[in-house]
Amino acid sequence: ESALITQQDLAPQQRAAPQQKRSSPSEGLCPPGHHISEDGRDCISCKYGQDYSTHWNDLLFCLRCTRCDSGEVELSPCTTTRNTVCQCEEGTFREEDSPEMCRKCRTGCPRGMVKVGDCTPWSDIECVHKESGTKHSGEVPAVEETVTSSPGTPASPCSLSG
């Protein structure tokens, strides 16, 4: 779940379609699975399989469901309260530096190194030097590693390249 959404990511709702349930906002906010009406008086349900909202919100539109790319498998479908969950196909992984695409895992380790970690949807194979046990310098850190280290690790302002 990450940033920079564009206008097409906001899924326009049909005007008061019969199947869209309405309820009243609570403290100006609508519950997950809903968005707020333009006049702020109603909460309108998202459309199953088309759009969603995950938290209490004052969104004018629900967010459009992600469609898994080729090279990805759908782990769970989009519901009104949760976006589609996509995962790289077997033999490929999504690295932190290019999260928009799945990349092929390496088939083996360089000479003088031994494999200590398998290819997963989140990481390439992990290689270490036979003697020193240190990781290969070209190793891409697994996404899981960045998640577990995220709490307070930024001791200095982090930067966004671009």
């Epitope: 990450s2 940033a3 968005h35 969104l59 999260p99």
Partner: nanobody, 125 residues
Framework: EVQLLESGGGLVQPGGSLRLSCAAS????????MSWFRQAPGKGLEFVSA????????YYADSVKGRFTISRDNSKNTLYLQMNSLRAEDTAVYYC??????????????????WGQGTLVTVSS
């Protein structure tokens, strides 16, 4: 290159208010969804609120609904979090976050690749 710097934290009594700011430098934030997370002492990261791109609306965690308000001033390249009716359980380091993937608002640590330094909020009498 964008750098994020939070400010506005401090010591406040229960029931009091604070306004946190997150100043971004190096690039406009107007086209980015941005979020606030917090980490209480000895606990994991918790999503607080997210500001969706282009004033499309905002997300709030159940725990802060009706008490906190997220906003932004694109002309000042700054994200805000107005915190009212503060409680002891709101004590935490508050982080401003942004990610680079063109998808949806950041509501989990997995999607938050870029963090500010954090600002400490202590609610105590």
């Amino acid at each position: 290159e964008v750098q994020l710097l939070e400010s506005g934290g401090g010591l406040v009594q229960p029931g009091g208010s604070l306004r946190l700011s997150c100043a971004a430098s190096g690039r406009s934030i107007s086209n980015y969804a941005m979020s606030w997370f917090r980490q209480a002492p000895g606990k994991g990261l918790e999503f607080v609120s997210a500001s969706v791109w282009n004033n499309g609306g905002n997300y709030y965690a159940d725990s802060v609904k009706g008490r906190f308000t997220i906003s932004r001033d694109n002309s000042k390249n700054t994200l805000y979090l107005q915190m009212n009716s503060l409680r002891a359980e709101d004590t935490a380091v508050y982080y401003c976050v942004v990610a680079r993937t063109p998808e949806t608002p950041i509501t989990s640590a997995r999607g938050a690749n870029y963090w500010g330094q954090g600002t400490l909020v202590t609610v105590s009498s």
